[in-house]
Each structure stands twice: as C-alpha cells, then as structure tokens.
C-alpha cells in the first residue's frame, strides 16, 4: 500500500520514527505521515533527537550521499509570531503538545532565519550528504524538500 519507509526505528521512550525520501511540499508530507497513522515528527532533545540522528546515519538516500538533503519536520513559526534571535529555536515551535526536553539541547541553525513577524514559515532538518545532521534551516512551506520524518 505505502512504499516502505527508507528507514525506521524506535527510541527508548517507545516512540517510533520513519524517514522517507520523497520530493514533497510540507503539507503533502504532513498528510503522508497522518495517512501512515502518525504525524510529522518533532525532533526535540534527548532520546528523540538521538533516535532521529540514528535514522539519518543509517545510510545515504538517493544520490548516494553526494549532496545535502532537506527533511520536513514538525517545526514552524506561526503567522504573527516573531523571529527570536536569542532563542534556541529562533521563535519556531514544535507542532505538538508533547512535553519535550530542554530547547537549549537542540541542533544548531545552518542559516539564521529571516527576521519577520508576519509570514508563516516552516523549517527542515538539513543533513549533510544525506546522513550527517547539520541542523535546522528555515524554508517556505510551499517549497519542496527531499523527504520527511514521521513519528508514531
């Protein structure tokens, strides 16, 4: 029914994650995760971050690891929320009410997000060579990333 996930794994907390290589807009990726019985993944601190990093490092995707890949995650800055340059997530937030770890214990930003308080913005996880997590990158929600991460 579904093309199988490129990689999947679970964390010590019992949550499971899947990584999919598919060129998609953010909305289509989020819908894909829901249709699979999950949701677009948060990548908070601690066990969750470790589980997702392990998925990425399990091997290169299409292209054999020759280029940086962008994966949709459940990170966005809502309209009317401002860029906060001194916050670890820069004013972005995870689309989940699950309790998370310390936001200070997160990946770095590959590029600083544009300063804005008006437009909704999404963010991707950039992986160098498709396997080594470089950090977060702001991305317009209607653009296509190389893949997405789901959480179950």
């Amino acid at each position: 029914e579904h093309p199988t996930a490129d990689r999947a794994g679970c964390s010590a907390s019992g949550a499971c994650y899947s990584l999919h290589h598919a060129t998609m807009k953010r909305q289509a990726a989020e819908e894909a995760c829901i249709l699979r019985g999950g949701a677009l993944s948060t990548v908070r601190a601690g066990a969750e971050l470790r589980a997702v990093l392990a998925l990425l490092r399990a091997g290169p995707g299409p292209g054999g690891g020759s280029k940086d890949l962008l994966f949709w995650v459940a990170l966005e800055r809502r309209r009317s929320h401002c860029t906060l340059e001194n916050e670890p997530l820069r004013g972005f937030s995870w689309l989940s009410s699950d309790p998370g770890g310390l936001e200070s214990d997160t990946l770095q930003w590959v590029e600083e997000p544009q300063r804005s308080c008006t437009a909704r913005r999404c963010a991707v996880l950039q992986a160098t060579g498709g396997v080594e997590p470089a950090g977060w990158k702001e991305m317009r929600c209607h653009l296509r990333a190389n893949g997405y991460l789901c959480k179950y």
């Epitope: 029914e1 989020e30 829901i34």
Partner: antibody
C-alpha cells in the same frame, strides 16, 4: 481556477468492475494528495482512500482495501478509482476531492460520479 | 478509528432563530483537524468551517464554530432560509479520516 471534473453516471451488473476518472486542472496535480469519498443515497460520507500522484503513494481505509484501487496518470492530470466485485452496497455517489489551502480540509470536490449496481 | 457522533440528527429552526449543533469525537481530536461541511441535495459537500473556527471563503459571518478535545459545535446566530442543509463534521487528526453522520437542518 481549481477544478475536478469527474466521469459520468455508471450502470453496472453485480460482480462487475467499474473505473471512474477525475481530471484535475488549475493546480499542480503532482503536489497534492487526491482523496476519494463515498456517499450512499440518503447517507453520510465515507473516506475511501487517497493517492499522491507525485510518487503514486496510496493509503486506503481498511474497509475499502480489496474493493477500491486508486491510480493516477500525471501526463493527463487524471486520478482514477476502480471498484471491483460490485454489489448493491456499492451503489453510491463517489467524489474525488483534495486539500488546497485550508488545514487538511477537503476544500475542492468533483461533482461526483453516480454508480448504480 | 475516531468515531464522530453528531446531534441532533435532524432539527428544525425558525427564521431568525439561533441554532447550535454538536459533534462529539470518540477520542481527542486536534482543533486544527476538525472541520465542517455543508451539503445541499444534489450537490457536492462544501467546506464550511475549517480548523474548528475558521469560516471558509464566502461563508456568512452568522456562522461560527468552536470546541476542543472531543466536543465541537457549529452555531448559526440567526437562521436564514439558505442555511437549510445537512452539515457534516470531519476529522483528519487520525487516519482513516472520518465524518459524522450529519445534522439535517430544516426550516420550521
């Protein structure tokens, strides 16, 4: 303007199969999931499944697995649904529908294809 | 799957009357993924209210939506003749997407 144009009314015998179409225009067909919904006469709405034309990924309501098959042809921006082993329970109006701009609500619908078994 | 129960199944209201119908989910649904559709006989459903409280394009301001968790409602502040229709709630928080059985609103 976004439009979903569905094929016409179908009359079919029990046990037969039917294939209906939904031609999309006014948006990038390969970028959005296309959903199918069933409505029996005088009844409510049931989600059948969805297809992502960009890579032919599909998802089905468990109830319709083995009954419905979803496909898409990107060159013509057309989605198809085939229903097999028809019974009286399959007599209904079938809608193709997709999200385009409001949080995952189905905000564009075809006019419906009526199937009578 | 998440079951959505709408009540009442059928209701009638006089012109100018305030109308409220409810949608109860069998388990919690994010307000972002709870929507309402209006359908009239012989027509396709139309998105009416999305994400619990946002009116779709062209929907009169007399309509409103509210709720959270397992309890949602659609309200018409002052019934008009064109509001006679069947209204369906719909969730997309969990797959499969599900719809309520509908509330048929008639003019008294």
């Amino acid at each position: 303007e976004v439009q979903l144009q569905q094929s016409g009314t179908v009359l079919a015998r029990p046990g037969a199969s039917v294939k209906m179409s939904c031609k999309a225009s006014g948006y990038t067909f390969t970028s959005y999931w296309m959903h199918w919904v069933k409505q029996r006469p005088g009844q409510g709405l049931e989600w059948i499944g969805a297809i992502y034309p960009g890579n032919s990924d599909t998802s089905y309501n468990q109830k319709f697995k083995g009954k419905a098959k979803l496909t898409a042809v990107t060159s013509t921006s057309t989605a198809y649904m085939e229903l097999s082993s028809l019974t009286n329970e399959d007599s209904a109006v079938f809608y193709c529908t997709h999200y385009y701009g409001s949080d995952y609500a189905m905000d564009y619908w075809g006019q419906g294809t009526s199937v009578t078994v | 799957q998440i079951v959505l129960t709408q009540s009442p199944a059928i209701m009638s209201a006089s012109l100018g009357e305030r109308v409220t119908m409810t949608c109860t989910a069998s388990s919690s649904v994010s307000s972002s993924y709870l929507h309402w559709y209006q359908q009239k006989p012989g027509s396709s459903p139309k998105l009416w209210i999305y994400s619990t409280s946002n009116l779709a394009s062209g929907v009169p301001a007399r309509f409103s939506g509210s709720g959270s968790g397992t309890s949602y409602s659609l309200t018409i502040s002052s019934m008009e003749a064109e509001d006679a229709a069947t209204y369906y709630c719909h969730q997309y928080h969990r797959s499969p997407r599900t719809f309520g059985g509908g509330t048929k609103l008639e003019i008294k």
